[in-house]
């Protein structure tokens, strides 16, 4: 979390920034409220991203103001408008680039002073992984697939009866490049694994942790699956 | 979720002032303008002025400016608008809202002043 | 001061009907307009704030449009329960102000 204060001879708001990541492909947000004003009229956002000359997006006078907008978010960029009356200057980022990556200053002026915060805004690919018992191997094997991640991820498999054991000689992972080059598919499979036994498959770069988890018992099969985005500071 | 408790009427004499409270709860007190506005039948709704618990920035209706002052007590989460000098005119319903889309109103406290 | 002007102070319309309310701003508001409900002996009700968007649990039948001047509050099909007085209202400048309000009643 990043708290902002204003630093001109008007008085200083509270802006607060919370650092953040973003799913190349998809929309993210970049997340900033301030302190808020009771009209509309005199409330001014201006997002800008380090080295970059143009505006990420500029929002005045109850509407966007776009004249400024750098060229690589043009079309792209959006506040949440029925919002901002109430302090929230979050940003909407359509389609995340991997270039969008960067700090990022949320900037805000009221009739009550000024204010920002910046924001460290990281991307890649991150995804669920799902496991599933391989009843093509010849022996009991276990099969974890995530469809897209990058930066390349490490892979671990734990267990819940064996904990602290170390999987690495029984398990092979593979990394397949997607269509786009630059996501990639991740593959893992662990072998001899037994019965009435949970098993995780963990999945973890510098952006993002997931963990599909598997029990394996004579009767049923049961699946559980979370994704966690790392490093979510607020500022 | 969010409530606003107001009282449900009030009686008071032409001249005398009178102190209408807004206890909120189910949100963030201090992270939400409180606004209080007034409804005469037949007059429509006016605002009167907002305050910003955190800060304690006022914004008043020029209107209003003499006749309503409005406190918070952060400490209960409770908003106050003191009314002075009061007249038949100032017979209405009065209420709080919070935030400055007037996002939940409270139910209201109805002053009548009369002799 | 932004006067708000709707200018039926009463619509009579039956269950299933569409309602087209209207509010004009005496000067350009954007888009900074809400629209409230308020029913017999309660407290007024947001159902939309800047224009168009319907807040949180109001039914999709009550719609808003418009920017500048001219703003539009639609119920697409009347249901007895909306039976009410609704107002306009600019957060864009202050003093912040309301519309007189359109009583919604049965033929």
């Known amino acids: 979390l990043i708290i902002g204060f204003g630093i001109s001879g008007r008085h200083s708001i509270t802006v607060t920034t919370v650092a953040s990541a973003g799913n190349i492909g998809e929309d993210g947000i970049l997340s900033c409220t301030f302190e808020p004003d009771i009209k509309l009229s005199d409330i001014v956002i201006q997002w800008l991203k380090e080295g970059v000359l143009g505006l990420v997006h500029e929002f005045k006078e109850g509407k966007d103001e776009l004249s400024e907008q750098d060229e690589m978010f043009r079309g792209r960029t959006a506040v949440f408008a029925d919002q901002v009356i109430v302090g929230n200057a979050s940003l909407r980022l359509k389609n995340v680039q991997l270039t969008d990556a960067g700090t990022y200053k949320c900037y805000i002026i009221t009739s009550k002073g000024k204010g920002n915060a910046n924001l460290e805004y990281k991307t890649g690919a991150f995804s669920m992984p799902e496991v599933n018992v391989d009843y093509n191997a010849s022996s009991e094997t276990l099969r974890c697939e995530a469809p897209r991640w990058f930066p390349q991820p490490t892979v671990v498999w734990a267990s819940q009866v064996d904990q602290g054991a170390n999987f690495s000689e029984v398990s092979n992972t593979s990394f397949e490049l997607n269509s786009e080059n630059v996501t990639m598919k991740v593959v893992s499979v662990l072998y001899n694994v037994t019965i009435n036994n949970t098993y995780s498959c963990m999945i973890e770069n510098d952006i993002a942790k997931a963990t599909g988890d598997i029990k394996v018992t004579e009767s049923e099969i049961k699946r559980r699956s979370h994704l966690q985005l790392l490093n979510s500071k607020a500022s | 979720q969010v409530q606003l408790q107001q009282p449900g009427s009030v009686l008071v004499r032409p001249g005398a002032s009178v102190k209408l409270s807004c206890k909120a709860s189910?949100?963030?007190?201090?992270n939400s303008w409180m606004n209080w506005a007034k409804l005469r039948p037949g007059q429509g709704l006016e605002w009167?002025?907002?305050?910003?618990?955190?800060?304690?920035?006022?914004e008043y209706n020029e209107k209003f400016k003499g006749k309503a002052t409005l406190t918070v007590d952060t400490s209960s989460s409770t908003a106050y608008m003191d009314l002075t000098s009061l007249t038949s005119e100032d017979s209405a319903v009065y209420y709080c809202a919070r935030d400055s889309r007037f996002s939940y109103w409270g139910q209201g406290t109805l002053v009548t002043v009369s002799a | 001061d932004i006067v708000m002007t709707q200018s039926h102070k009463f619509m009579s319309t039956s269950v299933g009907d569409r309602v087209s309310i209207t509010c004009k701003a005496s000067q350009d508001v954007r888009t900074a307009v809400a629209w409230y409900q308020q029913k017999p002996g309660q407290s007024p009700k947001l159902l939309i704030s800047?224009?168009?968007y319907r807040y949180t649990g109001v039914p999709d039948r009550f719609t808003g449009s418009g920017s500048g001047t001219d703003f539009t509050f639609i119920i697409s099909s009347v249901q007895a329960e909306d039976l009410a007085v609704y107002y306009c209202?600019?957060?864009?400048?202050?003093?912040?102000?309301f519309g007189a309000g359109t009583k919604l009643e049965l033929k």
């Open positions: 800047s224009t168009s």
């Open positions: 209202q600019q957060h864009y400048s202050t003093p912040l102000t």
């Open positions: 009167i002025g907002g305050i910003y618990p955190n800060s304690g920035n006022i």
């Open positions: 189910g949100y963030t007190f201090t």
